[in-house]
């Protein structure tokens, strides 16, 4: 009876279990009753990082110098190239597909430390009593407006992203 499942590092094809190609190699032809799976090594600028049945290897990532990228770790037949940014610049994401001079702190966060040539912007959440309603690479959290000092009352509470809204006091008639 033909198998319905195969062992690890095998795949089912034509009611038969064939060996997967090892990392760094691509599939040329499936196994048969009489022959093993045929695999070929990936080319110079290609890779496959898993046991696979892919017929094409993936291209190594290109670290585009026009985007400020450079190679941190050269790719192999089994691993992709890892990019990083030029000195003083910072990756915009884990994948490092582009570079920024410094990250900004989102609304609700203030700048704790402005970026330098070696370290990116350090953000901190605005604590109770403070807010930031902008994305910025230099602005700290701002204190809520003090309604009392203006002889007003709080009409709307502040949040980490919004200031309080002050209004006139109710006058007793």
């Amino acid at each position: 009876e033909p198998p319905t499942a195969c062992r690890e590092k095998q795949y089912l094809i034509n009611s038969q279990c064939c060996s997967l190609c090892q990392p760094g190699q691509k599939l040329v032809s499936d196994c048969t009753e009489f022959t093993e799976t045929e695999c070929l090594p990936c080319g110079e600028s290609e890779f496959l990082d898993t046991w696979n049945r892919e017929t094409h290897c993936h291209q190594h990532k290109y670290c585009d110098p026009n985007l400020g990228l450079r190679v941190q770790q050269k790719g192999t037949s089994e691993t992709d190239t890892i990019c990083t940014c030029e000195e003083g610049w910072h990756c915009t994401s884990e994948a490092c597909e582009s570079c920024v001079l410094h990250r900004s702190c989102s609304p609700g966060f203030g700048v704790k430390q402005i970026a330098t040539g070696v370290s990116d912007t350090i953000c901190e959440p605005c604590p109770v009593g403070f807010f930031s309603n902008v994305s910025s690479a230099f602005e700290k959290c701002h204190p809520w407006t003090s309604c009392e000092t203006k002889d007003l009352v709080v009409q709307q509470a502040g949040t980490n992203k919004t200031d309080v809204v002050c209004g006139p006091q109710d006058r007793l008639r």
Epitope: N66, L67, G68, C85, E86, W89, T92, S98, C99, V100, L101, H102, R103, S104, V134, S135, S136, A137, F138, E139
Partner: nanobody
Framework: EVQLLESGGGLVQPGGSLRLSCAAS????????MWWVRQAPGKGLERVSA????????YYADSVMGRFTISRDNSKNTLYLQMNSLRAEDTAVYYC?????????RGQGTLVTVSS
Amino acid sequence: EVQLLESGGGLVQPGGSLRLSCAASGFTFRDYEMWWVRQAPGKGLERVSAINPQGTRTYYADSVMGRFTISRDNSKNTLYLQMNSLRAEDTAVYYCAKLPFMFDDRGQGTLVTVSS
């Protein structure tokens, strides 16, 4: 496409003044925090000054505090840097930058040389 065109650089004697301008296009200038950064020969980029979108809040690096003034004219989509009491160590290519400052957003910069 973001375009930033810096101008106003030149050769100036120590103690002299220059006013740099940056003409912005390709984005809504009034919505963005803007920066001036500089790169001295053989050095990395240094953050010089920044201004919030409304022009009401500013930042200055310690090295230029009290000598440089950043400003903006949102009606003209232009950023300025007034540089007074210039020193030899202010010699650099000056770039204006929009937040976030993407590497490929850089303009050509304007060269400021302070020398006697």
